[in-house]
């Protein structure tokens, strides 16, 4: 941070030290030096001497004027030329900032990732403000009218343990900086409706050695309660389009899904489930890559190094896609 300096005078800014970008700005310098009747007063911005738009107002005071100031941040200081002194004498310094009032936060969403213990709310902050802007998330119980506030930057994690006022809430975010304040629209949430179930896991795959080779995918849904509706999507890695297989299940143990696939091909599998009566699907599971054997008579056997490396790499790349947008196709 900037070290404070002992001023031998005063420096001030009109309309203020923080102002709207594009405004005309005047920076004033008033010296109070002992044994000095300054020949000149000089202004420096970010360490560079200003050459233009400097006005000497009186013996002790000068002003520099900026038309349409558009620097997000600048450090100003002023000096005096004192007769008989070789160097300029420092008078005072000031940090100035320009920016914008905040936009009203938009597209607010709140979700509870299963087992996280938090309600995560995000929003669009709008155009950059360039100045320090605080966001306060307001959570109001529709049952008890109790209201809580959480300070944030561009998202917030609220412990579900702190949401003691029932299941229904109003949530909104307020953006505040030195130039203004805006509120988002209010979002009504029911805690049970915003749970994003944790993803299912595909644990392994095997292709049986038979006349018509059959691939079995082993997977487990983490949804514990009641009936579950699941989808498994799969495609050859060379293809763009997915095939989707649907399942109704109420099992919590490992599932087996059978597929009849082309030999000597690399396939990617993903699964997701939705509890009946629930709004939210799980995100797609991490991509699982399986290579089918060359012919019907050949038993699957992986060389120990190279293919595994490829699978890991593929999964990593896919994961980046699938987690950023659950509906987005992969590959």
């Amino acid at each position: 941070g900037i070290a404070t300096i002992n001023c031998s005078g005063n420096m001030w800014v009109e309309p203020g030290e923080i102002f709207q970008m594009g405004m005309n700005v005047s920076v004033y310098c008033q010296e109070a030096l002992k044994n000095c009747r300054p020949r000149n007063l000089h202004f420096y911005k970010n360490g560079f001497k200003e050459r233009f738009h400097i006005t000497r107002i009186n013996r002790t005071t000068a002003r520099v004027w900026y038309k349409g100031f558009s620097e997000p941040h600048a450090s100003m200081y002023c000096t005096a030329e004192c007769p008989g002194r070789f160097q300029e004498t420092l008078i005072c310094g000031k940090d100035i900032s320009s920016g914008y009032p905040p936009d009203a936060p938009s597209n607010m969403t709140c979700v509870i990732y299963e087992y996280s213990g938090n309600m995560t709310c995000t929003w669009n902050t709008g155009k950059p403000t360039y100045i320090d802007t605080k966001y306060t998330v307001h959570v109001k119980s529709l049952e008890t009218e109790e209201q809580q506030q959480y300070l944030a930057s561009n998202y917030v994690n609220i412990s579900t343990d702190s949401l003691q006022g029932g299941r229904k809430y109003l949530v909104w975010v307020q953006a505040v900086n030195a130039l203004g304040m805006e509120n988002s629209q209010q979002l009504q949430v029911h805690l049970d409706d915003i749970v994003i179930p944790s993803p299912s896991i595909i644990s392994r795959a095997e292709t049986t050695n038979a006349n018509v080779p059959k691939t079995i995918i082993y997977w487990k849904s983490k949804i514990m309660t009641g009936k579950v509706f699941c989808e498994m999507r799969y495609k050859a890695t060379t293809n763009q389009t997915w095939n989707v297989k649907e399942f109704d299940t109420n099992y919590t143990y490992v599932q087996q899904s059978e597929f009849y696939l082309e030999p000597n091909s690399k396939y990617v599998f993903q699964v997701r489930c939705q509890g009946t009566g629930k709004r939210n699907w799980q995100p797609w599971s991490s991509p699982f890559v399986h290579q089918t054997p060359q012919t019907a008579s050949q038993v699957t056997s992986k060389p120990p190094h190279e293919p595994q490396k490829i699978e890991m790499l593929t999964a990593t790349i896919f994961k980046g896609h699938s987690t950023s947008d659950n509906s987005q196709d992969i590959g």
Epitope: I5, N46, G47, F48, S75, M76, T79, Q87
Partner: antibody, heavy 122, light 111 residues
Framework: EVKLVESGGGSVKPGGSLKLSCAAS????????MSWVRQTPEKRLEWVAY????????YYPDSVKGRFTISRDNARNTLYLQMSSLRSEDTAMYYC???????????????WGQGTTLTVSS | DIVMTQSPASLAVSLGQRATISCRAS??????????MNWFQQKPGQPPKLLIY???NQGSGVPARFSGSGSGTDFSLNIHPMEEDDTAMYFC?????????FGAGTKLELK
């Protein structure tokens, strides 16, 4: 963690042009003045360009004035150096550097990128 | 332009001993009661790293064995005790006025 990553270097013939980029992360880019500094094959360091936080003020040494243009895009957190009429003496490693003020009047290059190499040769 | 002259061009120091690098400016780099003199360390394949600013202030995370002194035109960087990791090039730089200028560097090696 403050990170500056330069790109765009390469080989150019004398009289040619090239644009360097520097992607900044880990700090509020728009609040800092920035510079480009180059290092010759003989390891000499030379400051070549300065830009203010909003891009309104730029300064250059005489050796590159009129040939180099520094600019920035605060929305993209990126600093640029457009170089034209290149000469063999411009051959160097080009670093982007963040300029921090420790007082209103004392500024220091406190973080540097890893650099990108420019070779000017016929 | 302010010319910065560094000496020696190279220096070999034993582990635990003191290394002293000097830098002379062609004119005073003092103003407002401080010296606009900075020191950088550069290891092979890496960018310069700020060690000392305003002649004697340590940069962030810089070990206490690095210290700077001087004013006006004459400055020095001291490293004591010398460690293996200190093998590098060292540059002085003035930030008093543009163009900001650097010394030619001192190569510090382990004896």
């Amino acid at each position: 963690e403050v990170k500056l990553v330069e790109s765009g270097g390469g080989s150019v013939k004398p009289g040619g042009s090239l644009k360097l980029s520097c992607a900044a992360s880990g700090f509020t880019f728009s609040r800092y003045t920035m510079s480009w500094v180059r290092q010759t094959p003989e390891k000499r360091l030379e400051w070549v360009a300065y830009i203010s936080t909003g891009g309104g003020d730029t300064y250059y040494p005489d050796s590159v004035k009129g040939r180099f243009t520094i600019s920035r895009d605060n929305a993209r957190n990126t600093l640029y150096l457009q170089m034209s009429s290149l000469r063999s003496e411009d051959t160097a490693m080009y670093y982007c550097a963040r300029r921090t003020s420790y007082s209103y009047y004392n500024y220091v290059f406190d973080y540097w990128g890893q650099g990108t190499t420019l070779t000017v040769s016929s | 332009d302010i010319v910065m002259t560094q000496s020696p061009a190279s220096l070999a120091v034993s582990l635990g001993q003191r290394a002293t690098i000097s830098c002379r400016a062609s004119e005073s780099v003092d103003n407002y009661g401080i010296s606009f003199m900075n020191w950088f360390q550069q290891k092979p394949g890496q960018p310069p790293k700020l060690l000392i600013y305003a002649a004697s202030n340590q940069g962030s995370g810089v070990p206490a064995r690095f210290s700077g002194s001087g004013s006006g035109t004459d400055f020095s960087l001291n490293i004591h005790p010398m460690e293996e990791d200190d093998t590098a090039m060292y540059f002085c730089q003035q930030s008093k006025e543009v163009p900001w200028t650097f010394g030619a560097g001192t190569k510090l090696e382990l004896k």
